[in-house]
Amino acid sequence: SERCDDWGLDTMRQIQVFEDEPARIKCPLFEHFLKFNYSTAHSAGLTLIWYWTRQDRDLEEPINFRLPENRISKEKDVLWFRPTLLNDTGNYTCMLRNTTYCSKVAFPLEVVQKDSCFNSPMKLPVHKLYIEYGIQRITCPNVDGYFPSSVKPTITWYMGCYKIQNFNNVIPEGMNLSFLIALISNNGNYTCVVTYPENGRTFHLTRTLTVKVVGSPKNAVPPVIHSPNDHVVYEKEPGEELLIPCTVYFSFLMDSRNEVWWTIDGKKPDDITIDVTINESISHSRTEDETRTQILSIKKVTSEDLKRSYVCHARSAKGEVAKAAKVKQKVPAPRYTVELACGFGAT
């Protein structure tokens, strides 16, 4: 066959679908690789061809579109399963071609099983809700295109294993689930089950997402440096190890980049000749507020090092702050015998 632009196996789009449920999978070529859509390609006389490689096989084979009840079908740039079976797992390829042009991409499709509480190996999207916000909604995801707008599906919402009914602050509203004055106890996995009829059959779509309640922007503050502070003085003798922790609290802020760094005499540690190491640790509160600690360490400090300025800096979307550590050289303890001798006028 003539040369074909092969985009390879697109593992970025690891598609997971539930067993025994409908699945509609768009050819990724038009979404991520080509600059034109399916309609344009079709008008230009290009044909979309589908084939697949079964799990643990090397052989590419055509997809059987003649199964009973059209279990697998193609509609424009969409491959349909009505419904999926476990052994549909494999790598699927869509190829767009005519006599002079060819482009193709493969992607993995995994059909997964779920238990009666909707637990499965499915990777779950995470939806963040602000704590104590008035009304926030999540929407049953990825159900567009499965049924026409004239069909009115039934939607049932679950938290974990339990059907959501008479929950005080979680209210099902069709495709939406509303949270009123969210609390941390609203954290968890929420599942919508969408049931709709098609050609005398009943299909179910199961969609699970993880809700994480996070700090509210109304409570957000600029970074707070807990250490270094004015109460602690790092007093060292030359030759000792100098350890200075920089501990910073960051309020949760959606999409904020939290940064902590040290400067020594106004320069980044990488830009100076001192043998300094910096170790960072990060911890999170239940509402995803963040505490970052960067420990600056100089194994054998010199008297020159003890005269330098050590400043901890922190930055978030809320602002930038800095705090200098109080570092000084320890005054040597008086040598007892000499002091005593001088005191008695000995020569």
């Epitope: 104590e132 609390l183 106890s185 409570n219």
Partner: antibody, heavy 118, light 107 residues
């Protein structure tokens, strides 16, 4: 100093209505969820209703759902409880309280007595 | 809703003695539990939150412990002003619910 001052209580007949107010001072009222809590004579405490700091989210105890409406006016630093279709069992001292997700009700008003009787 | 059960209903203690009040939740409330003190004719006052953190201005003789479903309020040495009714309350789930109260009276 945080202060919460309730008013609007009184004697009302069954089926009647009453509107309670709670004037807040000494803190940024618009930054806090607020609640109403009641206490029937000689009985324990019962949470009645809560409202989010912007006023868009409201929650109610099952015992008052559909009859009571909580609201707030952040420009006036005031919390309200509109009570309709009152019943004898609604007789109680009604407290307004500042509500925090991490500490419960940290400040309370002195309460206002509502008596539902014919 | 989460049911909070306090015991005992009444506790008779002599001044200077130790008082231990219990509170049990019908399901886990993590450490989202508060204790309040109420004296006759007064509004409740927050004593303990987060199951064990004393609120501002609360004397050190008041301490709280527990997590999940079992909680305790301890008053190490009762003063005359401590004789009152004590309520536990969970704020883990809406609706926030209170225990029925424990009355601490002079023996």
């Amino acid at each position: 100093e945080v202060q919460l001052l309730e008013s609007g209580g009184g004697l009302v007949q069954p089926g009647g209505s009453l509107r309670l107010s709670c004037a807040a001072s000494g803190f940024t009222f618009s930054a806090y969820t607020m609640s109403w809590v009641r206490q029937a004579p000689g009985k324990g405490l019962e949470w009645v209703s809560a409202i989010s700091y912007e006023g868009d989210g409201t929650l109610y105890a099952d015992s008052v759902k559909g009859r009571f409406t909580i609201s707030r006016d952040n420009s006036k630093n005031t919390l309200y409880l509109q009570m309709n279709s009152l019943r004898a069992e609604d007789t109680a001292v009604y407290y307004c309280a500042r509500s925090l997700y991490w500490s419960g009700f940290d400040y309370w008003g002195q309460g206002t007595l509502v008596t539902v009787s014919s | 809703e989460i049911v909070m059960t306090q015991s005992p209903a009444t506790l008779s203690v002599s001044p200077g003695e130790r008082a231990t009040l219990s509170c049990r939740a019908s399901q886990s409330v993590s450490s989202n539990l508060a204790w309040y003190q109420q004296k006759p004719g007064q509004a409740p006052r927050l004593l303990i939150y987060g199951a064990s953190t004393r609120a501002t201005g609360i004397p050190a003789r008041f301490s709280g412990s527990g997590s999940g479903t079992e909680f305790t309020l301890t008053i190490s040495s009762l003063q005359s002003e401590d004789f009152a009714v004590y309520y536990c309350q969970q704020y883990n789930n809406w609706p926030w619910t209170f225990g029925q109260g424990t009355k601490v009276e002079i023996k």
